[in-house]
Interface confidence: low
């Protein structure tokens, strides 16, 4: 997790994941697991889910648990490196029965000059070097192979690509006498894809390039390039799609202007402007053509790059993203938030909602949080009654139903889901907020009061009686 976290969330939410949904027929969730042999054709993963479920129920006491771990493979091409020159790599868990491949790009901020990269190397070395990486990693959230934790793609081939280039996955410069650090994020992705072709990716039907935070932005920057790479290497049939989590940032005005001294106080535009030069950063070709030389930094911002992308991308973004608020200098620690800050936060939600208007596939809950797809509680959050795995499933189905992603989702199977309520945590399924100092869970009322929430003002804004608003909030809604 990245940066200064103002609020801590529990690892697991109180509500359980919604029931596991096998691929529903005609838009209806399947409520049990009867074996359905008629559905096998063209839907092998769904059939496998049924078989796995049956097998698990027949062997409740089996000690032969499937190994959930993803195993580390350092790149054979050692010239593609992390910041410090150590080889980059990836963690892989193969699923031989599946033709789906999920490649996940890790997040973790960035550094954009010698000073803050040195500081990062001292404090967060695993984000700049592969030297101390563990041999295995456990897949969580969308990388889990357990249907209960990952009703969406539990049976896929899982690849976790650690972030060790500090360049928002955009760099293409190697370590040299001139450069103390290598920035090869974009090249790492290309090399991982090349190596995976020899490990079964060549037979893939769908490659989903996913990522969180800086990895989410990395998806937007690299998804078209991966599709182009596979086409050039002779695999045009592999459908490449993107899933960008918590990487859709706004180049908005900071709440309080600050000098660009360190990573988290630097305004988004300043940081990326400096970074792109320092990293020799690459942006998608079609986006680059839209901006003049020196203005390529624009392509790091989702709402500007998205319209230029050829590959379908599903955007997951908290309306009140902690990383966005951090770079905007809204620090929700200590003192209650002043009214100006409160209005700024509400306005951020409105602006973000506006940028997602024309994004076909999106999931944007009105929560104060950061990252979701590899959290184990990723199934718990809902927007308008639909969970994220369900929305992703509906998005998937839109490709089956027509060769081009259908503009209109099937009835009862939505995948454009943006909360419309106006303040942080007005959605009852948001991840739990904890007070940073006491560690105690706060309900929405406590959280808003802590933020200096003025009942009269907000009630007025919402056009309701203060007593009604308080009643709603006291009940945690």
């Amino acid at each position: 997790s990245e940066g200064r976290k103002t609020w801590r969330r529990r690892g697991q939410q109180p509500p359980p994941p919604p029931r596991t949904e096998a691929a529903p027929a005609a838009g209806q969730p399947v409520e049990s697991f009867p074996l359905d042999f008629t559905a096998v054709e063209g839907n092998m993963d769904s059939f496998m889910a049924q078989v796995k479920s049956l097998a698990q129920s027949l062997y409740p006491c089996s000690a032969q648990q499937l190994n959930e771990d993803l195993r580390l493979h350092l790149l054979l091409n050692t010239s593609v490196t992390c910041n410090d020159g150590s080889p980059a790599g990836y963690y892989l868990k193969e699923s031989r029965g599946s033709r789906r491949w999920l490649l996940f790009l890790e997040g973790g901020w960035y550094c954009f000059n010698r000073e803050n990269c040195d500081s990062r190397y001292d404090t967060m070395r695993r984000l700049m070097s592969s030297r101390d990486w563990p041999r295995t990693r456990t897949g969580t959230g969308i990388l889990s192979s357990q249907p209960e934790e990952n009703p969406y793609w539990w049976n896929a081939n899982m690849v976790f690509i650690p972030y060790c280039s500090s360049d928002v996955w955009s760099g293409a410069s190697s370590k040299s006498e001139k450069n103390e650090y290598a920035f090869m994020g974009a090249l790492i992705i290309q090399e991982v894809v090349r190596e995976l072709l020899g490990r079964g990716l060549s037979g893939a039907k769908v490659l989903l390039l996913a990522g969180s935070s800086a990895g989410g932005t990395g998806v937007l920057l690299n998804v078209d390039r991966v599709a182009e790479q596979l086409e050039k290497l002779g695999y045009p049939a592999i459908q490449v799609r993107g899933l960008a989590d918590s990487g859709w940032f706004l180049d908005n005005k900071q709440y309080r202007r600050s000098d660009c001294i360190d990573t988290i106080n630097c305004a988004p535009t300043d940081a990326i402007r400096r970074g792109i030069r320092y990293w020799s950063g690459m942006v998608p070709e079609r986006c680059q053509r839209q901006f003049k030389e020196g203005e390529e930094w624009n392509c790091f911002f989702g709402y500007k790059v998205y319209p230029t992308l050829r590959c379908p991308v599903f955007v997951v973004q908290w309306l009140f993203d902690e990383a966005q608020l951090t770079v905007d200098n809204v620090h929700l620690t200590g003192q209650p938030v002043q009214e100006g800050q409160w209005l700024y936060i509400q306005n951020l939600g409105r602006e973000l909602r506006g940028t997602l208007k024309d994004v076909q596939a999106s999931f944007a809950p009105a929560c104060l949080s950061h990252e979701i797809i590899i959290r184990s509680y990723w199934t718990d959050v809902q927007v308008k009654g639909t969970s994220l795995p369900r929305a992703l499933h509906c998005w998937d189905r839109s490709f089956h139903d027509s060769h081009k992603a259908s503009k209109t989702p099937m009835k009862g199977c939505p995948f454009h889901l943006v909360d419309s309520c106006p303040w942080p945590h007005c959605n009852p399924s948001c991840p739990t907020i904890r007070d940073q100092f006491t560690g105690q869970e706060m309900n929405v009322a406590q959280f808003l009061m802590h933020m200096g929430f003025d009942v009269q003002t907000v009630a007025q804004q919402q056009g309701m009686e203060p007593s009604k608003l308080l009643g709603m909030l006291s009940n945690g809604n």
Partner: antibody, heavy 119, light 111 residues
Framework: EVQLVESGGDLVKPGGSLKLSCAAS????????MHWLRQAPEKGLEWVAY????????SYANTMKGRFTISRDNAKKTLSLQMTSLRSEDTAIYYC????????????WGTGTTVTVSS | DIVLTQSPASLVVSLGQRATISCRAS??????????MHWYQQKPGQPPKLLIY???NLESGVPARFSGSGSGTDFTLNIHPVEEGDATTYYC?????????FGSGTKLEIK
Amino acid sequence: EVQLVESGGDLVKPGGSLKLSCAASGFTFSDYGMHWLRQAPEKGLEWVAYISSGSTTLSYANTMKGRFTISRDNAKKTLSLQMTSLRSEDTAIYYCARKNYNGGYFDVWGTGTTVTVSS
Amino acid sequence: DIVLTQSPASLVVSLGQRATISCRASKSVSESGYSYMHWYQQKPGQPPKLLIYLASNLESGVPARFSGSGSGTDFTLNIHPVEEGDATTYYCQHSRVLPPTFGSGTKLEIK
């Protein structure tokens, strides 16, 4: 195992007082808002009172306001309900229940303790 | 207070068939796309047990035979196929505002 166990139920005369307790185990008690609910013999469920995780919000059903007091001790993982000026219509099984943060439903219930108000 | 009217008060369903229980609220219990309606099962001598939360979400460990639907003021609990052990009382509850209130209950019998 997540568990709530009520105690303190008894036979008491109208106008009398009684204090019910609820001991929590198996979860971080201080994280959760807690409720008391009750069920009169052969009747439905009725909400009694609510206390937020840090005791900052207290709320009571209208018919119990001024007579009942809800409190909690997070260090001891206990929830209490002090009942005064008891009436015959307060006769019921009293349950403590954990409020789920995400939406105000009761996801864990105690087994209940019986309060009988009769002369 | 929001009044919840549950119907029918009692219901007889054949083994393996569908049981449908309705709950109507005097005011909408939905807001911003969320419906604050929940369903419980209570067996004699036991506390209520949560089945469905936020109108349609199945509580962990509850069989998929139970499902919930509805929004605004009208909500439904469905049990299909019903089993012997389902013969007991079911309650709806809202948490839209304080105080939370319950329906008067539906007693399900299996024939």
